[in-house]
């Protein structure tokens, strides 16, 4: 199963992590799919390693673990997130997360 | 004995295209990732392409991105690159690889096919 | 892509010295590094992968360090066989890369 934060905020201009947790007693991860919306945020291949999309690379940091830290908030990051969870064996989980880019005060 | 055996090498005029083969033997070859590096004649190491044991993720350096393809026959043991759109930079000593298990260290290496595009 | 600064590019020194090489990768790449050693016209041989881990058959002169950006490799005591060209390789980020090389020569 997948679990994470449903909803999350920050600032804009600051920075936010985005982590979907798998547990699973038998299932290994052999790779995770990050989105925004429809858009390829990154990929997390256990044999191959990172790959963030061009268009992120200076705002998308790998980490902690299997999650992103992206950087540089704007009001236009605010929407949906989504990470895909490849295992073997035991098939793909998915997970959502909301984040919301508030104003800085 | 673990190997690995590249072929499909040879000279090539510029932009015609080449597909090497790596033909592994003595380990499961299934189970593993594997890559292609090259080096050109007096130069360093390049890394070139690697996919995982399913295919499922795959990359590229950009140096050949768009031009040159990964693929893998695992009931035939066997590893491919094909080559396509080749320039004179390409010229190089094609290795297969494959990686200590969860590491990505390089541990086995083919001898290596040499490519020369040149007219 | 994440460029590897290999240093020094060559080094002369003599048999049972100790001798260090470092690699520098211009983000941090966690503990996602290996260590290999080339002699002319031969394939390369892994040493050490992820840092500091020593390669089944590789002798224990030959060590690793480093995490995030800055990388060592070291040979405490440099015997005759050492003699060859050592490269740095991060597996964190697509591409991989390696470094451009360090060449290890008779003093």
């Known amino acids: 199963t997948i679990d994470t934060k449903r909803n999350i905020s920050a600032e804009e201009g600051g920075s936010v992590i985005l982590q979907c947790h798998f547990s699973s007693d038998t299932a290994e991860v052999t790779q995770v799919d990050w989105k925004q919306q429809d858009q390829l945020l990154a990929i997390y291949s256990v044999d191959l390693g990172w790959h963030v999309a061009s268009v992120f690379s200076d705002r998308v940091v790998p980490g902690p673990s299997l999650g992103l830290t992206f950087q540089s908030l704007t009001m236009n990051d605010t929407g949906e997130y989504f990470c895909t969870y490849h295992t073997y064996p035991g098939g793909i989980y998915k997970g959502r997360i909301f984040l919301k880019v508030q104003e800085s005060s | 004995e673990v190997q690995l055996v590249e072929s499909g090498g040879g000279l090539v005029q510029p932009g015609r295209s080449l597909r090497l083969s790596c033909a592994a033997s003595?380990?499961?070859?299934?189970?593993?990732?594997m890559h292609w590096v090259r080096q050109a004649p007096g130069k360093g190491l390049e890394w070139v392409s690697g996919?995982?044991?399913?295919?499922?993720?795959?990359g590229y350096a950009d140096s050949v991105k768009g031009r040159f393809t990964i693929s893998r026959d695992n009931a035939k043991n066997s590893l491919y690159l094909q080559m396509n759109s080749l320039r004179a930079e390409d010229t190089a000593l094609y290795y297969c690889?494959?990686?200590?298990?969860?590491?990505?260290?390089?541990?086995?290496w083919g001898q290596g096919t040499m490519v020369t595009v040149s007219s | 892509d994440i460029q590897l600064t290999q240093s020094p590019s060559s080094v002369s020194a003599s048999v049972g010295d100790r001798v260090t090489i470092t690699c520098r990768a211009s983000?941090?790449?966690?503990?996602?590094l290996a260590w290999y050693q080339q002699k002319p016209g031969k394939a390369p041989k892994l040493l050490i992968y992820?840092?500091?881990s020593l390669q089944s058959g590789v002798p224990s002169r030959f060590s690793g360090s480093g995490s995030g950006t800055d990388f060592t490799l070291t040979i405490s005591s440099l015997q005759p066989e050492d003699f060859a060209t050592y490269y740095c390789?991060?597996?964190?980020?697509?591409?991989?890369?390696f470094g451009g090389g360090t060449k290890v020569e008779i003093k």
């Open positions: 996919i995982t044991w399913n295919s499922g993720s795959i």
């Open positions: 690889a494959k990686p200590v298990p969860k590491s990505r260290g390089l541990d086995v």
């Open positions: 992820g840092a500091s």
């Open positions: 983000q941090g790449i966690s503990s996602w």
């Open positions: 003595g380990f499961t070859f299934g189970d593993y990732a």
């Open positions: 390789q991060q597996a964190f980020y697509l591409p991989w890369t």
